[in-house]
């Protein structure tokens, strides 16, 4: 298949059509639950998602939703108390109308004449907005995750089925399959579909084999495929890297622990804006790259790549993606240079002709037996203590 084209402006919601047509799956999702198969029921109305009305929520609708989401049948259908007190009871006879426009706008209901999603209809403004919300817990609590890839948007593909996390076999695994995974997880689109051994092998069962998604499915379990067979081993666990995953490198320095900061995000390498590049950000990056701590933030060069990423860290995060970050999709960093960093594990610190040495005194552990003290910006001597 052709690989899915990355959108200009990322939209991490599923790529369903804007309006539900008969024959399509229900425009429903479950939120604030323990998995994608439990939670508050929301229905899509044109471009927005709205909580479904609890007053008209029944077992048929619950069953239909669970089936439509590939979550088996419904285990429990309930109503969630509204975030604000419910509206007063009907007004006494003779009172003037209290029906405010906001109230009349109302909440949508999912009304089903049977337990099959094709027999359901989304009815707008069916309930008063302040009423209870529909909730459901489905029997088959299915979920999906990416593990051991350094973030929630890259790694080995694992599905939760029958209470157990398991892998997906890499036979026929391609970008369309990975695209469904990425979109389902809110991780954008697939940058890479990886065969086994790119990530650590799994340990549990292998839930799926011969997965063959079109790329349009909302959930991985909607894709054609076979149950995991015995001839698939964990050395064949499928993996994915999604556009929202961030990975970093330092370029143009003496080694991998020094240079210009570059982040791979949404399919391309980007430089990082130095207007918000401070010691805390440099520290997090050096540590996450296994390069020790940050020794210096040298003056940056003009952006050689698209420079659109900003980070703001407190210094305790494990990776830059755990920091507060923003990616400006339309403008390059205004009046800024590309961030650079020198980490303590860089071999340029061993070199006596290092062009720049930090002005402040920093103590850096290079090896357990040697400590280097850098005293003076002018003096390029290293004193071994």
């Amino acid at each position: 298949h052709p690989s899915p084209a990355p959108p200009d402006q990322l939209n991490t919601s599923s790529a369903e059509s804007e309006l539900w047509e008969p024959g399509e799956r229900l425009p429903v999702r479950l939120t604030n639950g323990s998995s994608s198969c439990s939670g508050t029921v929301e229905v899509r109305l044109e471009a927005s998602w709205e909580p479904a009305c609890g007053a008209l929520w029944d077992s048929r609708a619950a069953e239909a939703v669970c089936r439509a989401l590939g979550c088996g049948g419904a285990e429990a259908a309930s109503q969630l108390a509204p975030p604000t007190p419910e509206l007063p009871p009907p007004p006494a006879a003779g009172n003037t109308s209290v029906a405010a426009n906001a109230t009349l706008a109302g909440a949508p209901a999912l009304l089903c004449s049977g337990a099959e999603w094709r027999l359901c209809e989304v009815v707008e403004h069916a309930c008063r907005s302040d009423g209870r919300r529909a909730r459901v817990t489905c029997a088959e609590n299915r979920a999906l995750r990416l593990v051991d890839g350094g973030g929630a948007c890259a790694g080995r593909v694992e599905m939760l089925e029958h209470g157990e996390w398991g892998s997906v076999c890499d036979d026929t695994w391609d970008l369309e399959d990975a695209h469904v995974v990425c979109r389902q997880l809110g991780c954008g689109w697939a940058v890479q579909a990886l065969p086994g051994l790119h990530f650590t092998p799994g340990r549990g069962p292998i839930h799926r084999d011969q997965v063959n998604c079109s790329g349009a499915e909302a959930y991985l379990w909607d894709c054609p495929g076979l149950p995991g067979q015995h001839y698939c081993g964990h050395k064949e666990d499928a993996g994915a890297v999604c556009s929202e995953h961030q990975s970093w490198r330092l370029t143009g320095g003496a080694d991998r622990c020094e240079g210009q900061v570059e982040v791979h995000f949404r399919g391309v390498w980007n430089t990082v804006c130095d207007s918000e590049w401070y010691p805390s950000e440099a520290k997090v990056l050096c540590q996450s790259l296994g390069c020790g701590t940050a020794v210096e933030r040298p003056k940056g060069l003009p952006h050689s790549l698209s420079g659109r990423m900003y980070y703001s860290c407190n210094g305790e995060e494990l990776t830059l993606s755990n920091c507060s970050w923003r990616f400006n999709n339309s403008n390059l960093c205004s009046q800024s240079l590309a961030a650079r960093v020198l980490c303590s594990a860089s071999r340029s610190l061993h070199n006596l002709s290092t062009p720049e040495v930090p002005a402040s005194v920093q103590t850096v552990t290079i090896e357990s037996s040697v400590t280097v003290k850098i005293e003076n910006k002018e003096s390029r001597e290293l004193m071994l203590l």
């Epitope: 007053a55 008209l56 009423g131």
Partner: nanobody, 123 residues
Framework: QVQLVESGGGLVQPGGSLRLSCSAS????????MGWFRQAPGKEREFVAA????????YYADSVKGRFTISRDNSKNTLYLQMNSLRAEDTAVYYC????????????????WGKGTLVTVSS
């Protein structure tokens, strides 16, 4: 207390049409979502059609979809059910219902019931 009074029932031949009306005593008629239920002899009461407060949303039972049309006139405090292509199985007592919190699709949300009007479809 909202008083609901149905009218317009009667005997009609298969394939014929009838228009039921439901007049509400309440000046706050527009605060209520309205609907119709029916009960055939020896059967349980079943949902027919519902309409929200302002009339912008409607919902029908599968058995009447495309044949029946529910509407309301808030200025006249009146609910209507236009029934076309009537069949023998549409024979029942038709009840007008009013609901404060939600469209009256399920019986537990209904606040008020009318006394009913009989529709008989027979040749």
């Amino acid at each position: 207390q909202v008083q609901l009074v149905e009218s317009g029932g009667g005997l009609v031949q298969p394939g014929g049409s009838l228009r039921l009306s439901c007049s509400a005593s309440e000046r706050t008629f527009s605060d209520y979502a309205m609907g119709w239920f029916r009960q055939a002899p020896g059967k349980e009461r079943e949902f027919v059609a519902a309409i929200n407060w302002v009339g912008g949303s409607t919902y029908y039972a599968d058995s009447v979809k495309g044949r029946f049309t529910i509407s309301r006139d808030n200025s006249k405090n009146t609910l209507y059910l236009q029934m076309n292509s009537l069949r023998a199985e549409d024979t029942a007592v038709y009840y007008c219902v009013a609901s404060w919190g939600a469209m009256p699709v399920l019986t537990h949300v209904i606040n008020y019931w009318g006394k009913g009007t009989l529709v008989t479809v027979s040749s």
